[in-house]
């Protein structure tokens, strides 16, 4: 939506930052706009010698860059932070890293778990 | 429409202690939280530190721990950011900043500022 | 804490000049940046939040760009208005910081 009325959006949520910047660890966001204003969903990890590091993941506000993307799919070549958007309800759950220059497809996929509003 | 207002000037002895206000009007209060910013005379911006309105948890700079509480009044809508054992070097204009919940958290409103000096 | 580096300190201009301003950041940041423009005597203004998403209200002649460590705040035809200094922030990990601002002056 996001044409005319206010969206709400449901994302995965994370931040490996959360005692320092005094939000819960994990669960799910839901986000709630302004009329007229999208809302995404996004993933942020760091990949040190091909492990993972989950750096944040939520909701995130009105982006032209993450318009009509039904996949979080990072398409830096090499960052020290990775950043994918989206939108689409959950659609941060699973992350890619496209490069545009080419080279490998790598898709991250979550360990199960029993995730809890926040609010 | 959406505003922050804050209180007027002061005016304290090196020592002393400043409790500046900030009240929110045209939004819900316990969405967004409040972070403060000063300025020094012709200097730039400083981040010293935010609470979240909802529950009242805070975190503050290292650069003023142990000198700054902030805290708030939701049956008011407004916020507080107390200094203290002040010195010459906190004469500055401080600034409350409404920010989303929602990364990347940009400082959207900005109240208009309170000038606090600091002199004997 | 991340260093935020803004360059010029300050640049001279004339209404119509294409200004850049660039911010470093000591560190990956993605995209976690708000540009902010400040008058004398007044609060700041957000003009540009997640490196170039233009807030409501902006004019078009403003345009962020960037990711990571390097940024750019671009105005493409200075109008009088826009004499003032401009201050990079990021929000990716505290404690936030700031650039040390970059004031546009009238040529």
């Known amino acids: 939506s996001g044409r005319g009325e206010a969206e709400t959006r449901e994302c995965i949520y994370y931040n490996a930052n959360w005692e320092l910047e005094r939000t819960n660890q994990s669960g799910l966001e839901r986000c709630e706009g302004e009329q007229d204003k999208r809302l995404h969903c996004y993933a942020s990890w760091r990949n040190s010698s091909g492990t993972i590091e989950l750096v944040k993941k939520g909701c995130w506000l009105d982006d032209f860059n993450c318009y009509d993307r039904q996949e979080c799919v990072a398409t830096e070549e090499n960052p020290q932070v990775y950043f994918c958007c989206c939108e689409g309800n959950f659609c941060n759950e699973r992350f890619t890293h496209l490069p545009e220059a080419g080279g490998p497809e790598v898709t991250y996929e979550p360990p199960p778990t029993a995730p809890t509003l926040l609010t | 429409q959406v505003q922050l207002v804050q209180s007027g000037a002061e005016v304290k002895k090196p020592g002393a202690s400043v409790k500046v206000s900030c009240k929110a009007s045209g939004y819900t209060f316990t969405s967004y939280r409040m972070h403060w910013v000063r300025q020094a005379p012709g200097q730039g911006l400083e981040w010293m530190g935010f609470i979240v309105p909802s529950g009242g948890s805070t975190s503050y700079a290292q650069k003023f721990q142990g000198r700054v509480t902030m805290t708030r009044d939701t049956s008011t809508s407004t916020v507080y950011m107390e200094l203290s054992s002040l010195r010459s070097e906190d004469t500055a204009v401080y600034y409350c900043?409404?920010?989303?919940?929602?990364?990347?958290?940009?400082?959207?409103?900005w109240g208009q500022g309170t000038t606090v000096t600091v002199s004997s | 804490d991340i260093q935020m580096t803004q360059s010029p300190s300050s640049v001279s201009a004339s209404v119509g000049d294409r200004v850049t301003i660039t911010c470093r950041a000591s560190q990956g940041i993605s995209r976690w940046l708000a540009w902010y423009q400040q008058k004398p005597g007044k609060a700041p203004k957000l003009l540009i939040y997640?490196?170039?998403s233009l807030q409501s209200g902006v004019p078009s002649r403003f345009s962020g760009s960037g990711s990571g460590t390097d940024f750019t705040l671009t105005i493409s035809s200075l109008q009088p208005e826009d004499f003032a200094t401009y201050y990079c922030q990021q929000a990716f990990s505290h404690p936030w910081t700031f650039g040390g601002g970059t004031k546009v002056e009238i040529k």
């Open positions: 997640a490196a170039s």
């Open positions: 900043a409404r920010v989303s919940m929602y990364a990347p958290e940009p400082m959207d409103v």
